[in-house]
């Protein structure tokens, strides 16, 4: 058996700094939560303790605070690179500043793959955006490989500003051939990472043959097993288990929003890539977890421009 730890965030919405418990501006620092400096502390702690770890984001890093207003996505690339994310799926809000506002600050600057299988570029945009985002990526993890296939809400044209040269296809229709392609490449452990909401996440788990795990976003769904640690009321257990049409138990996860929690899922695979077991819970990033001083110093450096903007 081979064990993989999936760390995941979604719908962070520009909460680079720590926030209050309700994800608004931090007032009393001793009771604040989240933020990339605190997230980094916890991620590094887990990376040090466990051998096979992936850090994934399921979209909507863009939009939500003055950080995005001022830095327009440059802050997302910078701090996700600093945390060494392994992959990200495109969310609808990544298109809020148009395709150019996605390409220049994020797609060209991210060191990690940015994914969506159901977004197809056409016309003059096709060559401009080619290779900057991918339908899937095969990631080496220790001596194994894991396939990550991305998806984005097909409602994005109605929710954001992707323009006329991007076609948002049905998620299940677009995902299946990409998963099939991964299978032909002998990739037998596949994560669907995307931003279409919990209902679609569950449908993907049910309908897309070959998907082993679904890591989602968009609906800000909070799942938890046991007594929840803060104010969020769980919509179900973590992971939420869907029985696929071909009889497999597929774990589906999401980690609320605003960087308040770090999703933590441990998956055990057999030698054929079948999920043997899955367990975990979102980790509440409260003040018991110190902010990493180095990332915090970087945040403070970037913060200066925001203070100038405010005044």
């Amino acid at each position: 058996a081979w064990e993989l730890t999936i760390l995941h965030t979604n719908d962070v919405h520009s909460r680079l700094e720590q926030t209050s418990e309700d994800s608004s501006k931090c007032v009393n620092a001793s009771r604040c939560m989240g933020g990339v400096a605190r997230l980094f502390t916890k991620v590094q702690q887990i990376r040090r303790a466990e051998p096979n770890v992936l850090l994934l984001d399921a979209g909507d890093q863009y939009q939500g605070t003055i950080w995005f207003t001022v830095y327009k996505g440059a802050e997302v690339a910078h701090f996700m690179n600093a945390l060494r994310y392994d992959a990200m799926a495109l969310g609808n809000h990544e298109f809020d500043n148009g395709v150019e506002g996605l390409i220049e600050p994020l797609l060209k600057e991210a060191k990690f793959p940015i994914l969506s299988a159901n977004i197809k570029a056409k016309g003059p945009l096709a060559s401009q955006i080619s290779g900057l985002y991918l339908p899937y990526k095969v990631l080496p993890v220790g001596d194994e490989v894991v396939g990550i296939v991305g998806y984005t809400s097909k409602e994005t044209p109605f929710l954001s500003n992707p323009g006329t040269n991007l076609v948002f296809e049905d998620e299940i229709t677009a995902l299946q051939p990409e998963v099939d392609k991964l299978k032909t490449l002998n990739v037998n452990k596949i994560i669907a990472l995307g931003h279409s909401g919990f209902e679609m996440d569950k449908l993907i788990a049910q309908k897309v043959r070959g998907v082993d795990v679904v890591v989602g976003g968009h609906s800000n769904t909070f799942l938890y097993t046991g007594n929840p640690p803060s104010k969020e009321v769980p919509a179900g257990k973590y992971p939420f288990i869907v029985t696929s049409d071909d009889g497999r138990k597929v774990p589906v996860v999401q980690a609320y929003a605003f960087g308040k929690y770090l999703g933590y899922l441990k998956i055990e695979f057999d030698e054929r890539g079948n999920v043997i077991s899955s367990h975990g819970n979102p980790i509440l990033l409260n003040s018991s977890i110190p902010e990493d001083p180095s990332i915090k110093a970087d945040i403070n450096k970037w913060r200066i421009k925001l203070d100038n903007y405010s005044t």
Epitope: Q44, V141, G142, D143
Partner: antibody, heavy 121, light 107 residues
């Protein structure tokens, strides 16, 4: 167990070329970034080159850029360093070392025993 | 390029001593720092990665700490086999760079 074995070192005249090899075993070679690190006699360690796990990117310090080329053959589990326009200051023990499984810079968890390269007329 | 400055360049100590080696980066490198041990005529050996994580098989008397620009390698109780040269290395960004080394000698 995991092993890295360098070969190809020797004595070479300034301006000439040499190709080093690093044969690996005991791990999934195609999953790891691989590096060359050198050590001049009596001196410290100097990083020379990296090639990412899939060969997509290569990075070098200014001291060897344009003269040295790192490559890999994942089907043979072997790493190479082609050294051209060699200079006296390239004299060193050359180690191959295993890096990480991503595109981010990394440390080296496994080292070979090294191969000596002497550039002298 | 990020410069790594190690101090001291050499030190003399006795078996059982607590030994501390420091490494300073010319700019912030978060926790992307490793430590290596090298004995004469041998290849370096990885001791610590991510500033404080012990590499598998390394004795627990070795520990690392620090973040940003200042880092420390500590040997809590020096053993005969620990007499060697120690190097720090940053892997925050390319080009990867090493400290100049600290030679730990028998007093």
């Amino acid at each position: 167990q995991v092993q890295l074995v360098e070969s190809g070192g020797g004595v070479v005249q300034p301006g000439r070329s040499l190709r080093l090899s690093c044969a690996t075993s005991g791990f999934t070679f195609s999953n790891y970034g691989m590096h060359w690190v050198r050590q001049a006699p009596g001196k410290g360690l100097e990083w020379v080159a990296v090639i990412l796990y899939d060969g997509s990117n290569k990075y070098y310090p200014d001291s060897v850029k344009g003269r040295f080329t790192i490559s890999r053959d994942n089907s043979k589990n072997t790493l190479y360093l082609q050294m051209n326009s060699l200079r006296a200051e390239d004299t060193a023990v050359y180690y191959c070392a295993r890096g990480g499984s991503s595109w981010y810079p990394d440390s080296f968890d496994i080292w070979g025993q090294g191969t000596m390269v002497t550039v002298s007329s | 390029d990020i410069q790594m400055t190690q101090s001291p360049s050499s030190l003399s100590a006795s078996v059982g001593d607590r030994v501390t080696i420091t490494c300073r980066a010319s700019q912030g490198i978060s926790s992307w720092l490793a430590w290596y041990q090298q004995k004469p005529e041998k290849a370096p050996k990885s001791l610590i990665y991510a500033a404080s994580s012990l590499q598998s098989g390394v004795p627990s008397r070795f520990s690392g700490s620090g973040s940003g620009t200042d880092f420390t390698l500590t040997i809590s109780s020096l053993q005969p086999e620990d007499f060697a040269t120690y190097y720090c290395q940053q892997y925050n960004s390319y080009p990867l760079t090493f400290g100049g080394g600290t030679k730990v000698e028998i007093k």
